[in-house]
Amino acid sequence: LTCLGGFASPGPVPPSTALRELIEELVNITQNQKAPLCNGSMVWSINLTAGMYCAALESLINVSGCSAIEKTQRMLSGFCPHKVSAGQFSSLHVRDTKIEVAQFVKDLLLHLKKLFREGQFN
């Protein structure tokens, strides 16, 4: 995930309880990871901007058969107004770098923790 800093406002923000639950699930994934997450599957990195939740879902939805991230995929769909299908890239504007799912989850988790600490939620 790119653009961890350098933006003034994250745009619209979620309720704190929802953000907290998503963070808890990502923490659970990273702590329980033994073998390479999703067999080392690669996903598109995303820009951590206002549209990052839909972008994150659009990236992760293309990983199939990985039970470890299925709950995260379902949860992210609550943050996105519209249904997201595999191969859909309306929010994922820039597709230039692929990273492992494990790194994607770690980067997303770090960013969400930062938003939570800064009180960027409803």
Epitope: R74, M75, S77, G78
Partner: nanobody
């Protein structure tokens, strides 16, 4: 044109239950995340609960967790909110919105249904 029609509100005693419904039309209901919000008398709009398009992921504000249950029937284009163990502080106008956890403050909503919890 998006149309959302809430129903099921009413006067109920503390500890009682109600089931709110929201009939949706004018869009492909099963393609959208849906959210319930509420507005108490003299207060601002507050988020209550959200369900994803497939209905397999739900979120609740802390104060209603364990008491309220959001669900949807995509075949009937209907969103539900089961209210249980109601408290006086749950008194509000309840609105359904075609909105996610992010977009709920500025999304279209119906005319609402009034829930009054009083003894």
């Amino acid at each position: 044109e998006v149309q959302l029609l809430e129903s099921g509100g009413g006067l109920v005693q503390p500890g009682g239950s109600l089931r709110l419904s929201c009939a949706a039309s004018g869009f492909t209901f099963s393609d959208y995340t849906m959210t319930w919000v509420r507005q108490a008398p003299g207060k601002g709009l507050e988020w209550v609960s959200t369900v994803n398009p497939d209905g397999d992921s739900t979120f609740y504000r802390d104060s209603v967790k364990g008491r309220f249950t959001i669900s949807r029937d995509n075949a009937k284009n209907t969103l539900y909110l089961q209210l249980s163990s109601l408290k006086t502080e749950d008194t509000a106008m309840y609105y359904c919105t075609k909105a996610s956890l992010i977009t709920w403050p500025q999304s279209p909503r119906g005319q609402g249904t009034l829930v009054t919890v009083s003894s």
